[in-house]
C-alpha cells in the first residue's frame, strides 16, 4: 500500500525549467520531460568534431561523454560515468529517471572542445525545478478525505445492516406470539379511538 502511494506521488511530479538566472544560461529548451524522466539537452556547435561533454549537477559530475578521432579519423565515443546518453550532430542528451525533489538543482553542460582548436571550455546551464502540479495537489488533498468518507459510509452501512438484521432476527426468534400481540395492540387502539369519539 505504501509503495503504491509512493508511486502515485512520483507520478504526480512535474518539471519546470527556470533558465536565464545564471551566467551562460542555455538559450534553448534544455530540459525535456517525458516518460517519467527528464532529457537534459547539451548542445555544441556543428563545427565541433572532438569534444568532452560533462553534465554537472551543482559541482558534481553526473555524466560524461567524450567523442574523439584517432590518427586515421576513426571515431571513439567514451563514457566515464555510466549514464543513458544520446549523441547527435550538434547535441548530447543525458537522461535522468525516477525523479524526486532531490533532483531539483542547477544543471550545467560543461563542454570541452578539442577540435577544432584552440582548446576551449564553455559552460551552459539552467535550473531544474521539480514541483507538484495543481491537479495532483488537489487530488492529494481530496483523496484522503474521499477515502475517509468512503470508509465512514461503509462502516455506517455495515452498522445499519447489522442493526436491521439483528432486529429482524430478535423479533422472529424471541417472540412466538408477536403477531397476536400486534393484533391486540391494533384492537386496543381502535377501542380507545371509539371512546374518544363518543366523549
Amino acid at each position: 500500500m505504501k509503495s503504491g502511494l509512493w508511486y502515485f506521488f512520483l507520478f504526480c511530479l512535474r518539471i519546470k525549467v527556470l533558465t536565464g538566472e545564471i551566467n551562460g544560461s542555455a538559450n534553448y529548451e534544455m530540459f525535456i520531460f517525458h516518460n517519467g524522466g527528464v532529457q537534459i539537452l547539451c548542445k555544441y556547435p556543428d563545427i565541433v568534431q572532438q569534444f568532452k561533454m560533462q553534465l554537472l549537477k551543482g559541482g558534481q559530475i553526473l555524466c560524461d561523454l567524450t567523442k574523439t578521432k584517432g590518427s586515421g579519423n576513426t571515431v571513439s565515443i567514451k563514457s566515464l560515468k555510466f549514464c543513458h546518453s544520446q549523441l547527435s550532430n550538434n547535441s548530447v542528451s543525458f537522461f535522468l529517471y525516477n525523479l524526486d525533489h532531490s533532483h531539483a538543482n542547477y544543471y550545467f553542460c560543461n563542454l570541452s572542445i578539442f577540435d577544432p582548436p584552440p582548446f576551449k571550455v564553455t559552460l551552459t546551464g539552467g535550473y531544474l525545478h521539480i514541483y507538484e502540479s495543481q491537479l495532483c495537489c488537489q487530488l492529494k488533498f481530496w483523496l484522503p478525505i474521499g477515502c475517509a468518507a468512503f470508509v465512514v459510509v461503509c462502516i455506517l452501512g455495515c452498522i445499519l445492516i447489522c442493526w436491521l438484521t439483528k432486529k429482524k432476527y430478535s423479533s422472529s426468534v424471541h417472540d412466538p406470539n408477536g403477531e397476536y400481540m400486534f393484533m391486540r395492540a391494533v384492537n386496543t387502539a381502535k377501542k380507545s379511538r371509539l371512546t374518544d369519539v363518543t366523549l
Epitope: 574523439t68 584517432g70 590518427s71 586515421g72 579519423n73 571513439s76 577544432p116 582548436p117
Partner: antibody, heavy 117, light 111 residues
Framework: EVQLVESGGGLVQPGGSLRLSCAAS????????MDWVRQAPGKGLVWVSN????????NFAPSVKGRFTISRDNAKNTLYLQMNSLRAEDTAVYYC??????????WGQGTLVTVSS | DIVMTQSPDSLAVSLGERATINCKSS??????????LIWYQQKPGQPPKLLIF???TRQTGVPDRFSGSGSGTDFTLTISSLQAEDVAVYYC?????????FGPGTKVDIK
C-alpha cells in the same frame, strides 16, 4: 611537460619477438589516442598502429597486421607494442606518439629495433 | 590507402630566402570544411616536430615564417625566410582515413 619514453628495442633474429613499451607522463594518458610510428634507417616515417583511450578500438598498418599487437595500461600510463614473427624489413626506430586530436603533437625519442641473423 | 607524394625530394636555399615544399595526395583530404593534412619537421637524430595542422593552422610556438596552404589534393609548406635552424627533413601526413600515411619527405639545406 609531456614526456614519452620508449624502451624494449634491441637486436632480434628473424621470426623472433620483441615487446616495446612507452612510458607516458605530464598529461592525462587515458584522454588520448596513442600511436606507434616507425622509421627505417635513412628512410621516411611509416605509421604502424594506434589505440583509442581504453583499448576498444585498434588499427594496424597492413604490413604488420596479424603479427603486431598494440595495448595500453592506463593505470601505469604505458603503451605497448608486441611484435611477433619479426622480419628484416621491420628494422627501424620505433616512435611512440601522442595523437593530440588533430596531429601527432608529442613524440618519444624512439627505440631502435634491429632484425638480423 | 591514400598515397602522399612530395616535391622536390630536396632543395637548397640561401639564408633569408623563401623555401617552398609541395605535397600531393591521391585523393581529396577535404571534409567538413577541413583539410586533413599535417606538416612535420625532423632534424637529424631527433623525432619529428609538429609544425602545421589542418593544412594551414600553425602549432603553438612555431615561428610565423612557417605557413601552410592548399586544399583538396594540393598543399604547400612555405618557409618565408630560411634560418640555419630550419635545416631538416619536412614531411606531410594525412589523417583523412585509416591508415594515415606520410609523404616521403623533402630535405631542406642551406645553399
Amino acid at each position: 611537460e609531456v614526456q614519452l619514453v620508449e624502451s624494449g628495442g634491441g637486436l632480434v633474429q628473424p621470426g623472433g619477438s620483441l615487446r616495446l613499451s612507452c612510458a607516458a607522463s605530464g598529461f592525462t594518458f587515458s584522454d588520448y589516442w596513442m600511436d606507434w610510428v616507425r622509421q627505417a634507417p635513412g628512410k621516411g616515417l611509416v605509421w604502424v598502429s594506434n589505440i583509442d583511450h581504453d583499448g576498444n578500438i585498434i588499427n594496424f598498418a597492413p604490413s604488420v597486421k596479424g603479427r603486431f599487437t598494440i595495448s595500453r595500461d592506463n593505470a601505469k600510463n604505458t603503451l605497448y607494442l608486441q611484435m611477433n614473427s619479426l622480419r628484416a624489413e621491420d628494422t627501424a626506430v620505433y616512435y611512440c606518439a601522442r595523437w593530440g586530436h588533430y596531429a601527432f603533437d608529442s613524440w618519444g625519442q624512439g627505440t631502435l629495433v634491429t632484425v638480423s641473423s | 590507402d591514400i598515397v602522399m607524394t612530395q616535391s622536390p625530394d630536396s632543395l637548397a636555399v640561401s639564408l633569408g630566402e623563401r623555401a617552398t615544399i609541395n605535397c600531393k595526395s591521391s585523393q581529396s583530404l577535404l571534409s567538413s570544411g577541413y583539410n586533413y593534412l599535417i606538416w612535420y619537421q625532423q632534424k637529424p637524430g631527433q623525432p619529428p616536430k609538429l609544425l602545421i595542422f589542418y593544412a594551414s593552422t600553425r602549432q603553438t610556438g612555431v615561428p610565423d615564417r612557417f605557413s601552410g596552404s592548399g586544399s583538396g589534393t594540393d598543399f604547400t609548406l612555405t618557409i618565408s625566410s630560411l634560418q640555419a635552424e630550419d635545416v631538416a627533413v619536412y614531411y606531410c601526413q594525412h589523417h583523412y582515413s585509416s591508415p594515415p600515411t606520410f609523404g616521403p619527405g623533402t630535405k631542406v639545406d642551406i645553399k
